[in-house]
């Protein structure tokens, strides 16, 4: 039994890191393998992650971690019984994929303005709380070409757009994702989408 693709890990910079790897053949990850991990820290202890299958030869492990700080470094040992298959390390702050924003809501009762709000996925004491920026994706269910992205580069988790920038009388969906420039993170997953019916009063045309 050998590792074909070494484990690569990403952290949510809060409490979970996800490591994925591939074996050289079909493997029952949960019965044959264990991933041991330990924070390099005077008061830390070793933990064991039981991997799950991720395709025939692929394995994935969800590592429960202490609250992350930038200096953290974890040792990783992949075992098959008594055989050490791979040894490595992982700095969560260097491989961050933020959590997805939640609670996306479209407020349509503000005159002819659409107000989209969502929740920051981090608590205020987390470093990423004040460092996230967002991308909002709005698309029409009726017209696949009607697809737009709004970049929200300020900290407030909200977006205002004129309802008239979208077509009236049809349904739209929106979703939002996050990233943090300070740690050069990847984008988060998209939030669940929310749907609304866009309607606004067309201004009378002047002839």
């Amino acid at each position: 039994m050998k590792v074909l693709q070494e484990p690569t890990c990403v952290s949510d910079y809060m409490s979970i890191s996800t490591c994925e790897w591939k074996m050289n053949g079909p493997t029952n990850c949960s019965t044959e393998l264990r991933l041991l991990y330990q924070l390099v820290f005077l008061l830390s202890e070793a933990h064991t992650c039981i991997p799950e299958n991720n395709g025939g030869a692929g394995c994935v492990c969800h590592l429960l971690m202490d609250d992350v700080v930038s200096a953290d470094n974890y040792t990783l040992d992949l075992w098959a019984g008594q055989q050490l298959l791979w040894k490595g390390s992982f700095k969560p702050s260097e491989h961050v994929k933020p959590r997805a924003p939640g609670n996306l809501t479209v407020h349509t009762n503000v005159s002819d303005t659409l107000l989209l709000t969502w929740s920051n996925p981090y608590p205020p004491d987390n470093y990423l709380y004040n460092h996230l920026t967002y991308a909002v994706n709005i698309w029409s269910e009726n017209d696949p070409a009607d697809f737009r992205i709004y970049n929200v580069t300020y900290l407030e988790p909200s977006l205002r757009i004129a309802a008239s920038t979208l077509k009236s009388g049809i349904s739209y969906r929106a979703r939002v994702r996050a990233w943090a420039q300070c740690y050069n993170t990847t984008w988060s997953e998209w939030s669940p989408s929310t749907k609304w019916h866009n309607s606004y009063r067309e201004p009378f045309e002047q002839h």
Epitope: F41, L42, L43, D66, D67, P124, D125
Partner: antibody, heavy 115, light 109 residues
Framework: EVQLVQSGGGLVHPGGSLRLSCAGS????????MFWVRQAPGKGLEWVSG???????SYADSVKGRFTISRDNAKNSLYLQMNSLRAEDMAVYYC?????????WGQGTLVTVSS | EIVLTQSPGTLSLSPGERATLSCRAS???????LAWYQQKPGQAPRLLIF???SRAPGIPDRFSGSGSGTDFTLTISRLEPEDFAVYYC??????????FGQGTKVEIK
């Protein structure tokens, strides 16, 4: 908002015992190492003890064998049991949350050791 | 045990002046584990700098940290009235644990 609220300080005779408490809120207590740091009157800061999320502990040589740090994650609380107290243990004791450094501190509680 | 020695013991300066505080370690310290704190009378310490040079959230940019190995510096570019306090450096070591310097008092001249 992160808060660390301390209690349990007071006057104790040399050789006596005292238990300090620190209640945490506004963060996930169980995922954080916790510490005690003290400051004798007019002196500098001295690290006393720390406890990891899994219960691993460490002590300064000056308190080893006399002080015991513990935590109750269900109550979001940190404790310091101080036995065989000496005059040189008299200080303001702070609880702190952190790891390699201490971003969050309690308000401090005064322990007076005097006959 | 790693010993941190701060100098000077007391720094007498006027508001608007630049303050340079030194922290010297008895053996090499990882920059990732070097921090600076400010403490005012009757208050708990406040983290200013971590990782030798990163400002903690909410700390004004007049505070900066630098250094590596055994020599570290905290600089306050222009002293404000609220900056007069005692400053401590602190290090963490995987075997020796946590130690503080003895402090530098920045007082009004």
């Amino acid at each position: 908002e992160v808060q660390l609220v301390q209690s349990g300080g007071g006057l104790v005779h040399p050789g006596g015992s005292l238990r300090l408490s620190c209640a945490g809120s506004g963060f996930t207590f169980s995922r954080n190492a916790m510490f005690w740091v003290r400051q004798a009157p007019g002196k500098g800061l001295e690290w006393v003890s720390g406890i990891g999320t899994g219960g691993a502990t460490s002590y300064a040589d000056s308190v080893k064998g006399r002080f015991t740090i513990s935590r109750d994650n269900a109550k979001n609380s940190l404790y310091l049991q101080m036995n065989s107290l000496r005059a040189e243990d008299m200080a303001v004791y702070y609880c702190a949350r952190g790891r390699y450094y201490f971003p969050w501190w309690g308000q401090g509680t005064l322990v007076t050791v005097s006959s | 045990e790693i010993v941190l020695t701060q100098s000077p013991g007391t720094l007498s300066l006027s508001p608007g002046e630049r303050a340079t505080l030194s922290c010297r370690a008895s053996q090499s310290v990882s920059s990732s584990y070097l921090a600076w704190y400010q403490q005012k009378p009757g208050q708990a310490p406040r983290l200013l700098i971590f990782g030798a040079s990163s400002r903690a959230p909410g700390i004004p940019d007049r505070f900066s940290g630098s250094g590596s190995g055994t020599d570290f510096t905290l600089t306050i570019s222009r002293l404000e009235p609220e900056d007069f306090a005692v400053y401590y450096c602190q290090q963490y070591d995987h075997s020796a644990g946590w130690t503080f310097g003895q402090g530098t008092k920045v007082e009004i001249k």
